[in-house]
């Protein structure tokens, strides 16, 4: 058993039929010695008396809020949560496996630049009685500070018969140099509590590997005389690291109709302009990627050919 | 500790081309190592990230763009002094800081070159003959060093009398390639910045 936060404890259980469970001793946080009784949740049934209560925790019915009283007055609470371990593996029932970039990916993180700011998100089908707490650091043995905000519900989607909820959190490395060469990864730890179930999820990454620039901005078209060619120009996104001559981007320019199966024109360039062939009912799209370290491409920025 | 804006004329920077070739060569070599050594811990997630130049050179600090010198997190206190002549420099316009930056890059290359050559000698003794260093990568390191053209003491190639542990050597190769790729990215950024200034 260990303390998650004040008056909240996590009991780690090997989860299999007829498992013996864990013996837990609860101590009432009071100077009183006599006349103390214990109850669980809203029940008035007295579970025991005395300053300590010894319980055998085997299942979710044994978890919950244990309260010690004296003469009708509440002295203290202890909330017991269960963390299940099945076949030596901690349960991952609360969050959905996003399967990208690989199986067992519960947390996904992205950074728009090298400032040390990043966003992580996760998915669940659970809508109520759900709380998240996020901690992060650079490295684990001698951790350096990363400050994370509160996790918030960022999107709701319908997936078949199920509703899916996306939560996200923003974190910022306390002292980040955009030009630094990372040798220790960022560690992100998410504690998830659903009713009386506790789970934890972790992700480890280098900022350089989770870079995904914002789309290029200010796309403009200039038709070329006596030609079907169009000069398209754009600018670096405002959120990208500066100076741009040091943090350079490369771009992919594509002309395509509404369907992915349609024919297209595509060209890659390090410049902020390119010449392409425009077709009726097609769009010109541009996306960006770090020129020197190939992490993710940005989303497309698009303008219609006409 | 930083690069002032007074640098060579745009497009007149011979090291840019070499640094692009360097990044390409080390990225290709790393990809080849990952594929060939697929049953070894050779991915970014699996290896320890070591920097053989740590406390010996200060390339990131010495080559910091002027715009980042206002960022206190970038101003590490490490300082190293270097020899200050080099052919990538447009002599009259070259600042002392830029010379420091380029000579730090030179020292990095020299250290990695020695490590890679030593490692290759060991890998050539491996009866499995599983992986060798790409001669093109070694040549590109050499070309960039020649373009930088700093006079520097020759670092003797490490020779080892004990029987090489080929498993450890291959893991060390992965560690070295990952670190060198990251340094090659920094070098490319620096050269691009200098070329544009």
């Amino acid at each position: 058993i260990w303390e998650l936060k004040k008056d909240v404890y996590v009991v780690e259980l090997d989860w299999y039929p007829d498992a013996p469970g864990e013996m837990v001793v609860l101590t009432c946080d009071t100077p009183e010695e006599d006349g103390i009784t214990w109850t669980l949740d809203q029940s008035s049934e007295v579970l025991g008396s005395g300053k300590t209560l010894t319980i055998q925790v085997k299942e979710f019915g044994d978890a919950g809020q244990y309260t010690c009283h004296k003469g009708g007055e509440v002295l203290s609470h202890s909330l017991l949560l269960l963390h299940k371990k099945e076949d030596g593996i901690w349960s991952t029932d609360i969050l959905k496996d996003q399967k990208e970039p690989k199986n067992k990916t519960f947390l996904r993180c992205e950074a728009k630049n090298y400032s040390g700011r990043f966003t992580c998100w996760w998915l669940t089908t659970i809508s109520t009685d759900l709380t998240f707490s996020v901690k992060s650091s650079r490295g684990s043995s001698d951790p350096q500070g990363v400050t994370c905000g509160a996790a918030t519900l960022s999107a709701e989607r319908v997936r078949g018969d199920n509703k899916e909820y996306e939560y996200s959190v923003e974190c910022q490395e306390d002292s980040a140099c955009p030009a630094a060469e990372e040798s220790l990864p960022i560690e992100v730890m998410v504690d998830a509590v659903h009713k009386l179930k506790y789970e934890n999820y972790t992700s480890s990454f280098f900022i350089r590997d989770i870079i995904k620039p914002d789309p290029p901005k200010n796309l403009q078209l200039k038709p070329l005389k006596n030609s079907r060619q169009v000069e398209v120009s754009w600018e670096y996104p405002d959120t990208w690291s500066t100076p741009h001559s040091y943090f350079s981007l490369t771009f992919c320019v594509q002309v395509q109709g509404k369907s992915k199966r349609e024919k297209k024109d595509r060209v890659f360039t390090d410049k902020t302009s390119a010449t392409v062939i425009c077709r009726k009912n097609a769009s010109i799209s541009v996306r960006a990627q770090d020129r020197y370290y190939s992490s993710s491409w940005s989303e497309w920025a698009s303008v219609p050919c006409s | 500790r930083n690069l002032p804006v007074a640098t060579p004329d745009p497009g007149m920077f011979p090291c840019l081309h070499h640094s692009q070739n360097l990044l390409r060569a080390v990225s290709n070599m790393l990809q080849k190592a990952r594929q060939t050594l697929e049953f070894y811990p050779c991915t970014s997630e699996e290896i320890d990230h070591e920097d053989i130049t740590k406390d010996k050179t200060s390339t990131v600090e010495a080559c910091l763009p002027l715009e980042l010198t206002k960022n206190e997190s970038c101003l590490n206190s490490r300082e190293t002094s270097f020899i200050t002549n080099g052919s990538c420099l447009a002599s009259r316009k070259t600042s002392f800081m830029m010379a420091l930056c380029l000579s730090s890059i030179y020292e990095d290359l020299k250290m990695y070159q020695v490590e890679f050559k030593t490692m290759n000698a060991k890998l050539l003794m491996d009866p499995k003959r599983q992986i060798f260093l790409d001669q093109n990568m070694l040549a590109v390191i050499d070309e960039l060093m020649q373009a930088l053209n700093f006079n520097s003491e020759t670092v003797p190639q490490k020779s080892s009398l004990e029987e090489p542990d080929f498993y450890k050597t291959k893991i060390k190769l992965c560690i070295l390639l990952h670190a060198f790729r990251i340094r090659a990215v920094t070098i490319d950024r620096v050269m691009s910045y200098l070329n544009a200034s």
Epitope: R261, E262, K263, K264, V267, F268, T269, D270, R279, K280 | -
Partner: antibody, heavy 118, light 107 residues
């Protein structure tokens, strides 16, 4: 199986014109750009121009501008390349090639030898 | 026009050995570079597109690398059917241009 089948060899006099055909099978004809590329004996490849069969849009290499005309007939899934004012240096194998991407070629025809000789 | 220069123009190789063909552009073309294989009397075949992207159906022994002005086609272990002429082609700008070709011959 996508295929491009070209017309047979031609012998032409200097100053005349030649029209080479390229019939596509497999896939929808108008879903692809169609290009013409030539190769003089013992020489490399030389791009001549492209057509979008969907709308008839064309673009030609400046070297051939005014002398080459590329057309397409959707009903027969056939593209044509006509080269006029022939000279001996136009002796070459002419290839048609196509792709859904405009700037490179994933399927090529077998080639048509055009000999220009007096 | 962008001039594409291949080297060597002729490359004698022993079967089973690796082979590398270089292609240089007269100006930077990013990764807008494609490789083709040509055999006498056969339709040309696309091997690699956008410098390093592999094509399904093309053996994995063919790989491409490079960006900017310098590109390489590598055949890791030459098979008898690989003896042919190889061309690079730039698609950075029109007119599309090819290298002069490299003939890979049996040593």
């Amino acid at each position: 199986q996508v295929q491009l089948v070209q017309s047979g060899a031609e012998v032409k006099k200097p100053g005349s014109s030649v029209k080479v055909s390229c019939k596509a099978s497999g896939g929808t004809f108008s879903d692809y750009y169609l290009h013409w590329v030539r190769q003089a004996p013992g020489q490399g490849l030389e791009w001549m121009g492209w057509i979008d069969p969907e709308n008839g849009d064309t673009e030609y290499a400046p070297k051939f501008q005014g002398r080459v005309t590329i057309t397409a007939d959707e009903s027969t899934s056939t593209a044509y390349m006509e080269l006029s004012s022939l000279r001996s240096e136009d002796t070459a194998v002419y290839y048609c090639a196509r792709n859904k991407e405009l700037r490179y070629f994933d399927v090529w025809g077998q080639g048509t030898l055009v000999t220009v000789s007096s | 026009d962008i001039v594409m220069t291949q080297s060597p123009l002729s490359l004698p190789v022993t079967p089973g050995e690796p082979a590398s063909i270089s292609c240089r552009a007269s100006q930077s073309i990013s990764i807008n570079l494609h490789w083709y294989q040509q055999k006498p009397g056969q339709a040309s075949r696309l091997l690699i597109y956008f410098a390093s992207q592999s094509i399904s159906g093309v053996p994995s022994r063919f790989s491409g690398s490079g960006s900017g002005t310098d590109f390489t086609l590598t055949i890791s272990s030459l098979q008898p059917e690989d003896f042919a002429t190889y061309y690079c082609q730039q698609s950075n700008s029109f007119p599309l241009t090819f290298g002069q070709g490299t003939k890979v011959e049996i040593k």
